[in-house]
Interface confidence: low
């Protein structure tokens, strides 16, 4: 993950006995919120593992890197980071592991320089469609976000809203076409059953896409054609059974792509022939020599690159649950 990191050398801590800071006045330039550590030289504020239940109001205006990890924020309301004067320098915001279950519309408004946002490891039962766009207009102002890290944001089953989790996340990514400049998107470990096709078509600037450790069975509906800048596509640890010709051709046509396909339950029957042929010829798949068959039983652990057409038959027919989709 590309979470913001700090090169800070000297941090000042606020007095430990102070209550969680609530200030009606603009902060002094060198003020550090209660329960946080600040380094003006590194333009970094760390409020880490302090069980904060809200974003401190008195964040220093100089902050570029803000770590609010390991807290108990629960809800990010609209304008959670809106300040007067605005936090005009804030570029990297890490909110991972802070027990967020709701991110409301406009939560990240008034952060004109925000390029990197990490919401990983929060059980996001309610992610507003307008969390990142801040507007319900059909086309909103472009977001400055370049990297969006949303690994393991799927809530426990009993806390989910009665709706598609994939649909909720996709709606937030696509609202108002605000994320046209997004270059890195990480969606690992979210139990995705599908990759909704719109995500890729409407995020044309993507360089890095991480969909590892999901439950993707098929890429049949997905088009990579427009992602001419894509450099890495992580599909490890999914439930992929085969990649079909259309997908193979599109991947091969991307000039800078590296694809990661390890640990998928490849079904080595007649439908696999095109993929095997492609694997033998392509340079885009990293670690392609590690890819092995999972089904049918007689083919288990066979290396895909070592198969020939005679190995790949469709007789007997697989159980329905193993047929390629």
């Amino acid at each position: 993950s590309s979470s913001p990191t700090s090169s800070a050398s000297s941090f000042s801590s606020s007095a430990p006995f102070l209550a969680s800071a609530v200030s009606a006045q603009p902060p002094l330039p060198d003020q550090c919120p209660a329960l946080c550590e600040c380094s003006e030289a590194a333009r970094t504020v760390k409020c880490v593992n302090r069980n904060l239940t809200e974003v401190p109001t008195d964040l220093p205006a100089y902050v570029r890197n803000l770590f609010l990890t390991g807290n108990q924020l629960a809800v990010l309301p609209a304008g959670a980071f809106a300040r007067r004067p605005p936090l005009a320098e804030l570029a990297a915001l890490n909110l991972s592991g802070s027990r967020l279950d709701e991110v409301r519309a406009g939560a990240f408004e008034h952060l004109p320089s925000l390029r990197q946002l990490d919401l990983s490891h929060n059980p996001l039962a309610d992610l507003s469609p307008f969390a990142f766009s801040g507007s319900n207009a059909s086309v909103s102002a472009p977001s400055p976000l370049v990297e969006l890290i949303l690994n393991h944001i799927v809530p426990p089953e009993d806390e989910r809203q009665n709706r598609s989790f994939e649909g909720m996340v996709v709606a937030a990514l696509l609202a108002g076409r605000a994320l046209q400049g997004l270059r890195r998107l990480e969606l690992a470990s979210n139990h995705f059953l599908y990759l909704p096709r719109d995500v890729l078509a409407q995020l044309p600037s993507l360089r890095h896409l991480d969909l590892s450790n999901n439950s993707l069975v098929s890429l049949t509906y997905v088009s990579f054609r427009n992602l001419t800048h894509l450099e890495s596509l992580h599909l490890e640890d999914n439930a992929l059974k085969v990649l079909h010709n259309g997908t193979l051709a599109e991947l091969q046509g991307l000039p800078h792509i590296r694809v990661f396909l390890d640990n998928n339950p490849w079904v080595c029957d007649c439908h696999m022939a095109d993929m095997v042929t492609w694997l033998k010829e392509t340079e885009v798949v990293q670690g392609k020599d590690r890819l092995t068959c999972a089904y049918p039983e007689k083919m288990r652990n066979r290396v895909l690159l070592e198969l020939n057409s005679a190995d790949l038959d469709c007789d007997p027919i697989l159980p329905p649950s193993l047929q390629t989709s």
């Epitope: 469609p129 089953e157 009993d158 989910r160 809203q161 009665n162 709706r163 598609s164 989790f165 994939e166 649909g167 909720m168 996709v170 709606a171 990514l173 696509l174 609202a175 059953l193 599908y194 909704p196 096709r197 719109d198 995500v199 069975v217 159980p319 329905p320 649950s321 193993l322 989709s325």
Partner: antibody
Framework: QVQLVQSGAEVKKPGASVKVSCKAS????????ISWVRQAPGQGLEWMGE????????YYNEKFKGRVTMTRDTSISTAYMELSRLRSDDTAVYYC??????????WGQGTLVTVSS | EIVLTQSPATLSLSPGERATLSCTAS???????LHWYQQKPGLAPRLLIY???NLASGIPDRFSGSGSGTDFTLTISRLEPEDFAVYYC?????????FGGGTKVEIK
């Protein structure tokens, strides 16, 4: 309260197309998936596909691919299902339903489509 | 596709009796994505149980669900007159989504 109201019954000739509408109210239309399910007379339920109004992502049952088109108009909170090249065995009640992973919690009243020459 | 087989096809019982309906999947289904519906003649289905064992809103607690893997059960502890209907299981685990063929619970 949540409601899904469907368009009225249709009688069509074989080879024709039918377009059924499903108007949602009482909730944020773009936040929930809409599925389409049909039921032939005296038969069980058959899933046709689903549409995510927020992103317009659509997933069809392979059985209907090429014949079914699902669309939505978010401005009027309405989902549509069009089935083309109708056959007599397409005679059924067509339902829209809200929900997804946790079941279809609200259903439309159903639209009877009769295909007869 | 995942085939859901419901048994019995018809269950003839009297009010006050216990009803046990079975749903068997052709391959394993994540229990979070197995649901039950009730349908009465001329009406749309109604969600009864979601995620194998959770009562949907407004459903009386005489209904319960259980199971995992490939075998799931809907139980009605004490049949009321309004419970005589057709019951369907449904999986949202793999596309295409599928329903069982239904079990008709009729008055004996």
């Amino acid at each position: 309260q949540v409601q899904l109201v469907q368009s009225g019954a249709e009688v069509k000739k074989p080879g024709a197309s039918v377009k059924v509408s499903c108007k949602a109210s009482g909730y944020t239309f773009t936040d929930y998936v809409i599925s389409w399910v049909r039921q032939a007379p005296g038969q069980g339920l058959e899933w046709m596909g689903e549409i995510y109004p927020g992103s317009n992502s659509i997933y069809y049952n392979e059985k209907f691919k090429g014949r079914v088109t699902m669309t939505r108009d978010t401005s009027i909170s309405t989902a549509y299902m069009e089935l083309s090249r109708l056959r007599s065995d397409d005679t059924a009640v067509y339902y829209c339903a809200r929900g997804g992973n946790y079941g279809f919690d609200y259903w439309g009243q159903g639209t009877l489509v009769t295909v007869s020459s | 596709e995942i085939v859901l087989t419901q048994s019995p096809a018809t269950l003839s019982l009297s009010p006050g009796e216990r009803a046990t309906l079975s749903c068997t999947a052709s391959s394993s289904v994540n229990s979070n994505y197995l649901h039950w519906y009730q349908q009465k003649p001329g009406l749309a289905p109604r969600l009864l149980i979601y995620s194998t064992s959770n009562l949907a809103s407004g459903i009386p607690d005489r209904f319960s669900g259980s199971g995992s893997g490939t075998d799931f059960t809907l139980t009605i502890s004490r049949l009321e007159p309004e419970d005589f209907a057709v019951y369907y299981c449904h999986q949202y685990h793999r596309s295409p989504l599928t329903f069982g063929g239904g079990t008709k619970v009729e008055i004996k």
